[in-house]
Interface confidence: medium
Amino acid sequence: RAVPGGSSPAWTQCQQLSQKLCTLAWSAHPLVGHMDLREEGDEETTNDVPHIQCGDGCDPQGLRDNSQFCLQRIHQGLIFYEKLLGSDIFTGEPSLLPDSPVGQLHASLLGLSQLLQPEGHHWETQQIPSLSPSQPWQRLLLRFKILRSLQAFVAVAARVFAHGAATLSP
């Protein structure tokens, strides 16, 4: 793995994979099915999803001081979204198109999370809230919101890895 018991990931590898995730998240977003945005509502349905916030040490100073705080937060988010994309929200009906990038997105989330997981070290992962609805018309809404939230998450993660690759790589 890229973090063999140490505290520094393979920043360049992580940067490349996170950029790929950004592209996939944006390409997957319009393909979740037709949804009338008037139906969306103001309050965030996926308000339990992980967000990278100020206290998570993902700013340049925090990354220099101890990148593990930020990397753990990113790792938690990646696992969270990876589980969501593998759940019946995305695997259930209505079926995604055969060429949907969601499958690739799912695999890439897992790949990046494995790059960040130190060998023999297990970070706590966040519990997935009971978001799984039984009805397809509700799944469409959740897919839309999850992917929109994922876009924001991977955009921040990509910036973190870009900074790390530029300034923290050995």
């Epitope: 509502g41 965030e44 349905t45 308000n47 009906e93 209505p94 009805q135 397809p136 018309w137």
Partner: antibody, heavy 117, light 107 residues
């Protein structure tokens, strides 16, 4: 025991407004999608609107979109339907229903809304 | 919108008869089909959900089958309390839509 009790129906003139309420008990209200279904006298069932457990998403039938607003107060275990610009064709018994599994598993007794001049 | 077509719109039957009501969707809805019973002046009652699952407390003489576009509600031996109107409903996509109803009357 699950109970859904609608109120707020009555006679209203065309163009008028009414607010229906549905008081829920016997289950954890904030966990469930809730909805309204109506039935015009002597007619079949028509879905009107549904709302996500958190209130963060709503769905409407085209016939009421822009005129009706569904909302909920999870602290009060109450579902609402604000009906504006009422028309004669909105005359119906309005039922509150709880979604469970893939269906509307529990229904209230209904409240009659009559739109007439 | 998905249209739900029920047939027949009404039928006459006797106690003990086997009764079959059909419901057709205008497009595939997989197994997202529910059946309700309604008696005059009362709220609808869920009988069958997900095409074939019997709702808790509903007698086993009621059964549902079908997938895709064609569905059936069967009452194996009609009882006096079964005389009512039956509705199918799809929960595949919004707007959620109901069939026009089938009124089961005493012959």
């Amino acid at each position: 025991e699950v109970q859904l009790l609608e109120s707020g129906g009555g006679l209203v003139q065309p163009g008028g407004s009414l607010r229906l309420s549905c008081a829920a008990s016997g289950f954890t209200f904030s966990y469930y999608t809730m909805g309204w279904v109506r039935q015009a006298p002597g007619k079949g069932l028509e879905w009107v609107s549904s709302i996500w457990p958190s209130g963060g998403a709503t769905w409407y039938a085209d016939s009421v979109k822009g005129r009706f607003t569904i909302s909920r107060d999870n602290s009060k275990n109450t579902l609402y339907l604000q009906m504006n610009s009422l028309r004669a064709e909105d005359t119906a018994t309005y039922y509150c229903a709880r979604d469970r599994d893939t269906a509307m598993a529990d229904w209230g007794q209904g409240t009659l809304v009559t739109v007439s001049s | 919108d998905i249209q739900m077509t029920q047939s027949p719109s009404s039928l006459s039957a006797s106690v003990g008869d086997r009764v079959t009501i059909t419901c057709r969707a205008s497009q595939s809805i997989s197994s997202y089909l529910n059946w309700y019973q309604q008696k005059p002046g009362k709220a609808p009652k869920l009988l069958i959900y997900a095409a074939s699952s019997l709702q808790s407390g509903v007698p086993s003489r009621f059964s549902g089958s079908g997938s895709g576009t064609d569905f059936t509600l069967t009452i194996s031996s009609l009882q006096p309390e079964d005389f009512a109107t039956y509705y199918c409903q799809q929960s595949y996509s919004t707007p959620l839509t109901f069939g026009g109803g089938t009124k089961v009357e005493i012959k």
